[in-house]
């Protein structure tokens, strides 16, 4: 059974992930970002279902494509290089989803833009955090 300390750790990790995703979204949505049109041509894949931490597998599998899109963006839109930013997110995702169980991600048929993709995972983090508090 989860202890209060492990719940607290999970909550902090989710909050960190949430902040990273929000930072990326803000950098992309920045009105000075001339790359938005080009970035929106990239297709992202969304999970059919995202209600548990194990579903973060679906986010992990899309981190490389996310890094590619961020490589297009002006570096001044973000505090970190895309590679470092994605690496940080990857570490949190791996800790949150755990490595004990191998979960096969199921993807929805429709693709999403980077903005829709980030918003979906931001909502996921907020929803899990709310169940922990």
């Amino acid at each position: 059974a989860p202890t209060s300390s492990s719940t607290k750790k999970t909550q902090l990790q989710l909050e960190h992930l949430l902040l990273d995703l929000q930072m990326i979204l803000n950098g992309i949505n920045n009105y000075k970002n001339p790359k938005l049109t080009r970035m929106l041509t990239f297709k992202f894949y969304m999970p059919k279902k995202a209600t548990e931490l194990k579903h973060l597998q679906c986010l992990e599998e899309e981190l490389k494509p996310l890094e590619e899109v961020l490589n297009l963006a002006q570096s001044k839109n973000f505090h970190l290089r895309p590679r470092d930013l994605i690496s940080n997110i990857n570490v949190i995702v791996l800790e949150l989803k755990g490595s004990e169980t191998t979960f096969m991600c199921e993807y929805a048929d429709e693709t999403a833009t980077i903005v829709e993709f980030l918003n979906r995972w931001i909502t996921f983090c907020q929803s899990i955090i709310s169940t922990l508090t």
């Epitope: 992202f44 894949y45 590619e68 297009l72 991600c105 993807y107």
Partner: antibody, heavy 121, light 113 residues
Framework: EIQLQQSGPELRRPGSSVKLSCKAS????????IHWVRHRPEHGLEWIGW????????RYAQKFQSKATLTADTSSNAAYMQLSSLTPEDTATYFC??????????????WGQGTLVTVSS | DIVMTQSPFSLAVSEGEMVTINCKSS????????????LAWYQQKPGQSPKLLIY???TGQSGVPDRFIGSGSGTDFTLTISDVQAEDLADYYC?????????FGAGTKLELK
Amino acid sequence: EIQLQQSGPELRRPGSSVKLSCKASGYNITDYLIHWVRHRPEHGLEWIGWIDPEDGETRYAQKFQSKATLTADTSSNAAYMQLSSLTPEDTATYFCARSLDSTPIYPFAYWGQGTLVTVSS
Amino acid sequence: DIVMTQSPFSLAVSEGEMVTINCKSSQSLLRSGNQKNYLAWYQQKPGQSPKLLIYYASTGQSGVPDRFIGSGSGTDFTLTISDVQAEDLADYYCLQHYITPPTFGAGTKLELK
């Protein structure tokens, strides 16, 4: 028809620099990234970097970071690459390239004919 | 960076034969979301620019003869040329375009026996 027309061969002394051009036709240069690739027969193909002509943003492979400088001029629908501090190892054919219509960055589908740069004293 | 290991270095063939060129990546090039492998194959003839033959590991580029077949997934890929023609003698390169920097294999020279 999409074409990338590159400038002619160059002979340079070690220590000097050279600027190559790549003129696009059949599409607007701001719609796609322009990549540069080096070919040396004994080393094969190496990606140098890309430029987004829309805003001049660039990305370089680490080994070319201080060797190549990519620029673009939207008014002439052309991209340029300057190579500095030339050494005999920079002797190669340099290609500019563009992605497929359906893919935003890679793979390279349209290529210039290449520019041979020879560095010799 | 992703390392692409291509083999063999060179290959001597007779017209009409079938040849296979292999390419191994240091990490998976498969994107789970669309089940596509971000690997391309190029042909380069002496004095010419490279020509895209195959992308997404198995999709033939428009106008490329169907004797060029790409296969494989994850980290192991193959370019098969069935019924080799004299005009196929060239250098062949694989390219991973999953993540920047894109990286090429060292190349395979196809020669006539």
